[in-house]
Amino acid sequence: AGVFELQIHSFGPGPGPGAPRSPCSARLPCRLFFRVCLKPGLSEEAAESPCALGAALSARGPVYTEQPGAPAPDLPLPDGLLQVPFRDAWPGTFSFIIETWREELGDQIGGPAWSLLARVAGRRRLAAGGPWARDIQRAGAWELRFSYRARCEPPAVGTACTRLCRPRSAPSRCGPGLRPCAPLEDECEAPLVCRAGCSPEHGFCEQPGECRCLEGWTGPLCTVPVSTSSCLSPRGPSSATTGCLVPGPGPCDGNPCANGGSCSETPRSFECTCPRGFYGLRCEVSGVTCADGPCFNGGLCVGGADPDSAYICHCPPGFQGSNCEKRVDRCSLQPCRNGGLCLDLGHALRCRCRAGFAGPRCEHDLDDCAGRACANGGTCVEGGGAHRCSCALGFGGRDCRERADPCAARPCAHGGRCYAHFSGLVCACAPGYMGARCEFPVHPDGASALPAAPPGLRPGDPQRYL
C-alpha cells in the first residue's frame, strides 16, 4: 500500500505563438481545479476506462479575474498535493490523465459553469520511494508543469511497496537472513513469504508461496521482461542477444498521438485513433462530454452532448461540488439530541443514543415511569431521563407519600383565613370578599364583581375549594 502524490507547479500559456485567451474575465471570474486519473501499466486504454489505480480531485484555486489588456499569466493554483492512495503493489509502470478544470463564478443562471480547459496524458515508469519526478506537458496552447512520486505507507517498503518492515526485536541487529529496511535502518525486513526465487524487484506476493509479476515482467519467478519474451515485431534486423526482431524507425515510433491516442500506420503517414473526449490530427484537442462520466458518486450529468458544450452534474443527496466529488458532513449540524452520537452513513443519518433516550434523533425519553408508582393518586411524568411525580392535592415529596400542608403557601387572599381540609383547603374570607380564594370583592349593592356565589352560600361564608 502507498500513495501517489502529484504537485502542480504551474498552468499557463505555453511557449511560442498563439497564446491562449485568459480563461477568466472581469465579467466572469473563475478558478481552477485539477483531476488526476491513474491506470496501471503502459496500457493503450481509452480515456473513459476506469481509473483502476485511483483518482483524485484538488481543492478549488483562488478566484482569478483577468486584468484587461494583460496577457494570460500563469493562473493561481489550488494549495496542496493531489494524493491517490493505492491498496496493492505499486505497478512500476502507469498511465496518467491530468485534467485542468475551470469553474466560472459569474452571475449566470443555474449556478457556476464548469468546463475542461486542458487534458494531458502520459505513460511513465516510476519506482516507489524514489525522488520527485518533474514533468512538462502541453495541451494545445496551454502548458502544465508538475512533479510526481509514489511513496509506500509503513510497514511497506521497496520499489513496489511489497516488502514489509517491522521494528527490530533486538536493539543492534536483524535476525538471520533479514536485512535492515533502508531508509528505516532501525527496522528490519519481515521474513519473505513469496515463492522461492521470486524476483524481489519485479515480483511480489500477497499470499505465502505465490509470485505475481509487476507490469512488464513475466515468467514463474518474474525474471523475464515481456519485451524479450514475445518477439512479434514485423520489421528490422534480428537481435543477437535476444533472438528477437528489433523494430526499425516507423511513422508511429515515439507515438505522435497525444492524450492516450493510439497510432496506426498508413501508406503515406500515420493515423491517430483518439480516446473519447479528444479529437484532432494528433488527439491534441480536448473536450469532456457526459459520455466521459465526469460526475462522481452517482451524480447525474446533463448537457455536454458534444465536447464544445458544458455539462452540469446534478448531485445526489449528501454530495456537492462541481463533479459531486465532496461528501457533505451532515453531522456538523448536530442533528442528534440529548447527547446522541451522530453517524453519517452516506445513505442515511443515524444517531446512537445515550442511555435513557430513543428515537431516530434521540428525541424521546425512555419511559422512566415504568414500574414506578406515585402514591396517593399522583401521576408519573417522564423527562430528562428521570421520573417525577405530579402529586394530588394535599400530597408532596418525590413519590407523593408526604402529606402536604395546603395552607403553607397562604392561598387565601385579602386576609382570608386558611383551614386544612381532607379534600384540600377552605378559605374563610374577610368581610367584603368572596370566592374559593377570597379573590372577588363584594360590591356595596350586594352584587359580586365576578361569578355569583353558588346557591346556598352567602358572601362572607367560608367556601371550600375542591
Epitope: P317, R330, L333, L349, P360, R361
Partner: nanobody, 115 residues
Framework: QVQLQESGGGLVQAGGSLTLSCAAS????????MGWYRQGDLVAGFTSEG??KYADSVKGRFTISRDDAKNMVTLQMNSLKPEDTAVYYC??????????????WGQGTLVTVKP
C-alpha cells in the same frame, strides 16, 4: 414530501451584504435542525438543541436567524469576501411525523463576491 425554497443569492462587491432565505414547506411535523452549507461544509445553522452554530471563517460577519412560525431560516451575510463566492445550499433535518425524520436539500443559490 418536503421542499426547501432558497432565495437571495446574487452578485455583490467585496465588503457588501446579502441576505439568504430558506423556507421549508410540505409535510412537516417539526424541524429538527436547519442551516446553510457551501462546498460541502457547514456555514451556519441551528442545531437540534436550538443553538446557532457558525464556521470559524464567517463568525462575526454572518448571522443566522429563524422564524419557527414560517419554518424559515435567514442568513444575513455582511463584509463579504471573494472567498465567500460559492453555491449556498439550504439543508434541513425534518420530522414528517413523530417517528420519521429525513434530511432535505435545497437546489442551491449562487453568491458571487467580486474583488
Amino acid at each position: 414530501q418536503v421542499q426547501l425554497q432558497e432565495s437571495g443569492g446574487g452578485l455583490v462587491q467585496a465588503g457588501g451584504s446579502l441576505t439568504l432565505s430558506c423556507a421549508a414547506s410540505g409535510s412537516i411535523f417539526s424541524i429538527n435542525a436547519m442551516g446553510w452549507y457551501r462546498q460541502g461544509d457547514l456555514v451556519a445553522g441551528f442545531t437540534s438543541e436550538g443553538s446557532a452554530k457558525y464556521a470559524d471563517s464567517v463568525k462575526g460577519r454572518f448571522t443566522i436567524s429563524r422564524d419557527d412560525a414560517k419554518n424559515m431560516v435567514t442568513l444575513q451575510m455582511n463584509s463579504l469576501k471573494p472567498e465567500d463566492t460559492a453555491v449556498y445550499y439550504c439543508a434541513a433535518d425534518i420530522f414528517s411525523d413523530r417517528d420519521h425524520v429525513d434530511w432535505y436539500w435545497g437546489q442551491g443559490t449562487l453568491v458571487t463576491v467580486k474583488p
